[in-house]
């Protein structure tokens, strides 16, 4: 808390300008009017105030707006945003994408802080859903943003927003998240032709069911091994050797290097050895010839 002291003669600030940068804490407190500060917030960001000085300016705004800052002030906070706590931000009502962008720009280079997470949460809740422009903005600043959301939160993403998603935005998504995103992507890209569709859907295939993988295998897509290794194990297991061969195309040779890793390992265990041998890759571990495979899960379902 800054002690209340009278402003020295001639030091009263008539505007927010560079003459304030060497004001001491108590001088800023005494000589800068909070209402003046609020109307000239855009100037604060052009002046290299120290952290100590920013603390004083924040204190003045807090006194002026105890219920939370208006958006006209929030939009121009600049580096002062770094001084805000999640509790401060929960009092705000941020509706403009421009305001969001301005504050994310200030935080650029930082990890997603609790302040930023709170700001985004307030903004998205206010909008009711993650629309394309918002998602575009958020993933531009934080490529991992999408994967930080819970499956429940992802369910509010409209399919139209999926067009904003880049492959790197999905790098840290787990299967539960891709399970939610894949159907949205399928819907979003449904009017594209085969090869273009595959390019767009590829990053989302970690959420694809068996029947969609079977359909892709009929389209000469030549899936790379990195994508194949991210597929759901339960979706890969029912695929036949012929289907996997068609799905991977020339990349099928890469299965040998991955034969000890899921889902390839588990898939091999489900295939007949003589079918695996047709690939000529030396894959071992399939079901020996003459053995009968009983699918107990299917039996249980029938009974």
């Amino acid at each position: 808390e800054v002690e209340k002291t009278a402003c020295p003669s001639g030091k009263k600030a008539r505007e927010i300008d560079e003459s304030l940068i060497f004001y001491k804490k108590w001088e800023l407190e005494a000589c800068v009017d909070a209402a003046l500060l609020a109307t000239q917030m855009d100037r604060v960001n052009a002046i290299p105030f120290t952290y100590e000085q920013l603390d004083v300016l924040k204190h003045k705004l807090d006194e002026l707006y105890p219920q939370g800052y208006p958006e006209s002030v929030i939009q121009h906070l600049g580096y002062l945003f770094l001084k805000m706590s999640p509790e401060d931000i929960r009092k705000w009502n941020v509706t403009s994408l421009e305001t969001l962008k301005a504050l994310l720009e200030v935080n650029k280079g930082h990890e997603m802080s609790p302040q930023v997470a709170t700001l985004i949460d307030r903004f998205v809740k206010g909008r009711g859903q993650l629309d394309k422009d918002t998602l575009d903005t958020l993933t531009a600043f934080y490529p991992g943003y999408l994967c930080s959301l819970s499956p429940e939160e992802l369910s509010s993403v409209p399919p139209s927003s999926i067009w904003a998603v880049r492959p790197q935005d999905l790098d840290t998504c787990d299967p539960r998240q891709l399970d939610v995103l894949y159907p949205k992507a399928r819907l979003a890209f449904q009017n594209m032709n085969g090869s273009e569709y595959f390019v767009k859907i590829q990053s989302f295939l970690g959420g694809a069911p068996t029947e969609d993988l079977k359909a892709l295998s009929q389209q000469n897509v030549s899936m790379d091994l990195a994508t194949f290794m991210k597929l759901r194990t339960d979706a890969v297991l029912p695929l036949t050797v012929a289907e996997v061969q068609k799905l991977l195309g020339p990349h099928v040779e890469g299965l040998k290097a991955e034969e000890r890793h899921r889902p390839v390992r588990d898939w091999i265990l489900r295939q007949r050895q003589d079918d695996l041998d047709t690939l000529g890759l030396g894959l071992q571990g399939g079901i020996p010839n003459g053995y009968l495979v009983l699918d107990l899960s299917m039996q249980e379902a029938l009974s």
């Epitope: 560079e18 002046i47 290299p48």
Partner: antibody, heavy 118, light 106 residues
């Protein structure tokens, strides 16, 4: 890309004067606060002087106050340091640096050596 | 505000994990930057706000700390990392630097 090039350094006798210049390019010079920072041989860094973007607000370290004058010409993208009444302890490499909004020194020149000796 | 760096010098080998500390004479929040200076060259900004990596700086450099105690860590020292490192506070004017830590080849 951003470039800061200092000039004007050299050998001067105690009590003498020198004028350092810093030519800036690759960024909007008039938007930036600029600093002079010096480094005595084998020693650390000392913030010597600071000038606001318009040139109206200036700072000097106590060690140079009254002897050094910082100025800028935004039309010429240039920063200056007029050094008078030089002392042996002013011997150093002098760097000009752009000062970010966070008060860090973002871009530096290569430095110019000032030697004060009789 | 005075900044005290320790150690003033250290010897290390390529691949070593190196830690340099900077202590402020009073609390400075996270208003601390780290610079690298190679012989005959100007300093280069590595880290600002105590832990944020400047654009283009390798991820083996990291910063931590808040208040009075700060650390610069190089996770796996590379040949080009042998240099002198300085901390700088920007919590209040005048802006000040630490005395430097020289990282030499063992």
């Amino acid at each position: 890309q951003v470039q800061l090039v200092e000039s004007g350094g050299g050998l001067v006798k105690p009590g003498g004067s020198l004028r350092l210049s810093c030519a800036a390019s690759g960024f909007t010079f008039s938007d930036y606060y600029m600093s002079w920072i010096r480094q005595a041989p084998g020693k650390g860094l000392e913030w010597v002087s600071y000038i606001s973007s318009s040139g109206s607000t200036i700072y000097y370290a106590d060690s140079v106050k009254g002897r050094f004058t910082i100025s800028r010409d935004n039309a010429k993208n240039s920063l200056y340091l007029q050094m008078n009444s030089l002392r042996a302890e002013d011997t150093a490499v002098y760097y000009c640096a752009s000062t970010s909004r966070r008060c860090t020194f973002q871009h530096w020149g290569q430095g110019t050596l000032v030697t004060v000796s009789s | 505000i005075q900044l005290t760096q320790s150690p003033s010098s250290l010897s290390a080998s390529v691949g070593d994990r190196v830690t340099i500390t900077c202590r402020a004479s009073q609390g400075i929040s996270s208003a601390l930057a780290w610079y690298q200076q190679k012989p005959g060259k100007a300093p280069k900004l590595l880290i600002y706000d105590a832990s944020s990596l400047e654009s283009g700086v390798p991820s083996r450099f990291s910063g931590s700390g808040s208040g009075t105690d700060f650390t610069l860590t190089i996770s796996s020292l590379q040949p080009e990392d042998f240099a002198t490192y300085y901390c700088q506070q920007f919590n209040s004017y005048p802006l000040t630097f630490g005395g430097g830590t020289k990282v030499e080849i063992k």
